[in-house]
Amino acid sequence: LEPSCTVSSADVDWNAEFSATCLNFSGLSLSLPHNQSLRASNVILLDLSGNGLRELPVTFFAHLQKLEVLNVLRNPLSRVDGALAARCDLDLQADCNCALESWHDIRRDNCSGQKPLLCWDTTSSQHNLSAFLEVSCAPGLASATGSGHHHHHH
């Protein structure tokens, strides 16, 4: 079982120093700041699931050198920043979504000896990300859905 920790209060002070190894901001409808970094030098698991996030501001994650698991499930991501994708040791847990193509490509080109990348569908089943992208995000399909999202997953 994956470890868990208690959800933080909805009123998050982004200037505060968090000392825990696990932070849970799940389901708080947060808006992540673009111009400041989360101060959590010990955190290895960060749960941002279910927050309606469309992007992951790279500055927000800049100082999380110990981060191992980033859970962004149940967020309608439209892009994943290249600098975040290039963190080869970061285990990103995200919905199956065509926006993960850049993450997949950067990992493939920059990170050797990695486990196959996974993504999650709406039933919480895991899928091989490569296979998902190949089947669901071919150029014709991506243009047909406009944003490139696999709409029936959201």
């Epitope: 470890p3 920790c5 000392s19 190894t21 696990c22 050198q65 110990k66």
Partner: antibody, heavy 125, light 107 residues
Framework: QITLKESGPGILQPSQTLSLTCSFS??????????VSWIRQPSGKGLEWLAH???????RYNPSLRSRLTISKDTSSNQVVLKLTNVDTADTATYYC?????????????????WGAGTTVTVSS | DVVMTQTPKSMSMSVGERVTLSCKAS??????VSWYQQKPDQSPKLLIF???NRYTGVPDRFTGSGSATDFTLTISSVQAEDLADYHC?????????FGSGTKLEIK
């Protein structure tokens, strides 16, 4: 096979500096997520975490002993060293080093999977 | 600091009996609790991590449960070789802390 082995002076006098070495094999302290902690145990008592050093040379200390502790690593010789200054009889204990490794199959956990056999330290005048 | 309180301090059980050891945290530590077994004159050995995950090679008679502040280690059918001290520890926040241990004796 992963092993850790502690070594120390055995006996020292109050006010001296205790220097302990953890020699390890079977893993590299340059691997992301890897780290080594020092933990001590007075005879017949519980465990007390002292300090941790990460693969990137970042360090954490127990605030109750922070002013007296220094942890360092030598990745080329696979050793972690702990120094405790101004020792007192209360520092008499068995000192263990223990490894924390990232678990890629159980993501996000933190635990000490391998411990050394320990080295006994007696502070006596 | 998070205080980990273990009960009982010691217990004496017969082979085959069910053993329940308790560990309480002074504040919420999620599931960042591990259990270690320490046999006489040996170093601690990992039994359970993440409150309920059995470590590789640990017999399935050992089971961990709990979250937040209340944690339990259960030995379903105690064996003579289970004579040991059992320690719980939290790795949710620095400084990491351990309970004072429970000594398990076999009748």
């Amino acid at each position: 096979q992963i092993t850790l082995k502690e070594s120390g002076p055995g006996i020292l006098q109050p006010s001296q500096t205790l220097s302990l070495t953890c020699s390890f094999s079977g893993f590299s302290l340059t691997t992301s997520g890897m780290g080594v902690s020092w933990i001590r145990q007075p005879s017949g008592k519980g465990l007390e975490w002292l300090a941790h050093i990460y693969w990137d040379d970042d360090k954490r200390y127990n605030p109750s002993l922070r002013s007296r502790l220094t942890i360092s690593k030598d990745t080329s010789s696979n050793q972690v060293v702990l120094k405790l200054t101004n020792v007192d009889t209360a520092d008499t204990a068995t000192y263990y080093c223990a490894r924390r490794a990232r678990d890629y199959y159980n993501s996000g956990h933190w635990y000490f999977d391998v411990w050394g056999a320990g080295t006994t330290v007696t502070v006596s005048s | 600091d998070v205080v980990m309180t273990q009960t009982p301090k010691s217990m004496s059980m017969s082979v085959g009996e069910r053993v329940t050891l308790s560990c309480k945290a002074s504040e919420n530590v999620g599931t960042y609790v591990s259990w270690y077994q320490q046999k006489p004159d040996q170093s601690p050995k990992l039994l359970i991590f993440g409150a309920s995950n059995r470590y590789t090679g640990v017999p399935d008679r050992f089971t961990g449960s709990g979250s937040a502040t209340d944690f339990t280690l259960t030995i379903s059918s105690v064996q003579a070789e289970d004579l040991a001290d059992y320690h719980c520890g939290q790795t949710y926040s620095f400084p990491f802390t351990f309970g004072s241990g429970t000594k398990l004796e076999i009748k």
